[in-house]
């Protein structure tokens, strides 16, 4: 992938819109289709004031851990869906799109150099454990996906891309 493709705002925008659309088709988070078991996902909350002052390396760790857990969560949802009788086709389609989207974003971030931030020297303080929560519906899962892209991922790539422009 071209090194700074993720710095083209249209790229991330496409995935954000796909995630929001997936959330919308699941008929609301209260009454939409349920997951047959709870799935652990990253907590997507961003403390705007503290995030802005985090080292870009710390941001990278949070983004990378979140992306990894989110990918596992959506693969788990895909497996649960495959095991259910007559899974809704639209749901299947959006799960497949999310998996493909997360794979692409992971590759783009790798090219951007986000992964090297995880290789911290042995004497550095280990990163704080990733905050997580559990979801019980497909809507909530897609909502976390949309929030993660719109929040931490967009804030992080924005910062890295800005630095690269200097």
């Amino acid at each position: 992938a071209p090194p700074r493709l993720i710095c083209d705002s249209r790229v991330l925008e496409r995935y954000i819109l796909e995630a929001k659309e997936a959330e919308n088709v699941t008929m609301g988070c209260a009454e939409g289709p349920r997951l047959s078991e709870n799935i652990t996902v990253p907590d997507t909350k961003v403390n705007f004031y503290a995030w802005k002052r985090m080292e870009v390396e710390e941001q990278a760790i949070e983004v990378w851990q979140g992306l990894s857990l989110l990918s596992e969560a959506i693969l788990q949802a895909q497996a649960l869906l495959a095991n259910s009788s007559q899974p809704p086709e639209t749901l299947q389609l959006h799960i497949d799109k999310a998996i493909s989207g997360l794979r692409s974003l992971t590759s783009l971030l790798r090219v951007l150099g986000a992964q090297k931030e995880l290789m911290s020297p042995p004497d550095t303080t280990p990163p704080a454990p990733l905050r997580t929560l559990t979801v019980d519906t497909f809507c909530k899962l897609f909502r976390v996906y949309a929030n993660f892209l719109r929040g931490k991922l967009k804030l992080y790539t924005g910062e890295v891309c800005r630095r690269g422009d200097r």
Epitope: K20, T44, K45, A50, K140, N147, F148, K154, L155, G158
Partner: antibody, heavy 123, light 109 residues
Framework: QVQLVQSGAEVKKPGSSVKVSCKAS????????ISWVRQAPGQGLEWMGG????????DYAQKFQGRVTITADESTSTAYMELSSLRSEDTAVYYC????????????????WGRGTLVTVSS | SYVLTQPPSVSVAPGKTARITCSGD??????VHWYQQKPGQAPVLVIY???ERPSGIPERFSGSNSGNTATLTISRVEAGDEADYYC???????????FGGGTKLTVLG
Amino acid sequence: QVQLVQSGAEVKKPGSSVKVSCKASGGTFRSYAISWVRQAPGQGLEWMGGIDPISGFADYAQKFQGRVTITADESTSTAYMELSSLRSEDTAVYYCARELYYPGTWMAVMAYWGRGTLVTVSS
Amino acid sequence: SYVLTQPPSVSVAPGKTARITCSGDNIPEYYVHWYQQKPGQAPVLVIYRDNERPSGIPERFSGSNSGNTATLTISRVEAGDEADYYCQVFDESSWHWVFGGGTKLTVLG
């Protein structure tokens, strides 16, 4: 129930400073950021900046950078907004708003508002 | 800095549906929040995250965000809905909360 009680109206001279307070009750003060928003007569809402009481980090809109200082005193559950070098265009109602993470939001929203403090700048 | 554009005024008859728009570049990529402000009062959050309603806000209030426009829809409009309505987004490129210019909703009759 969350309540934000703001200090009373002020009349100030151009070039002077004003400090508006916002006392919060209900809920844990340090858990929620406080934003300040102003509204000039007959105009819309304008975000000035805010503070995260846990870290003490404040952030300001570009327009007010260097003129506004936002602080928080955890012991009294009070946030403050000080605006210096006042000019007539600063005549406005100044609101504090407490931010809250609603279910499913990645970013806190301005959920609770004070009743506003009218600051009049006049010579 | 990001700009949100709202019509200055919208008029509607009681019992009808009012639609207040808010437009901005690639607005569907943002989460839009809506506030209601009655004369002499502080703003009140009526919709957050495009289409979610805080508790205590009637079901008549709903939101959507697609195309280049976010819309606040108030169905079965009542006289008490007369107010100014503001849309809001967080613009991470400037790290600012941005408000639209506001729309005055007038309930006719």
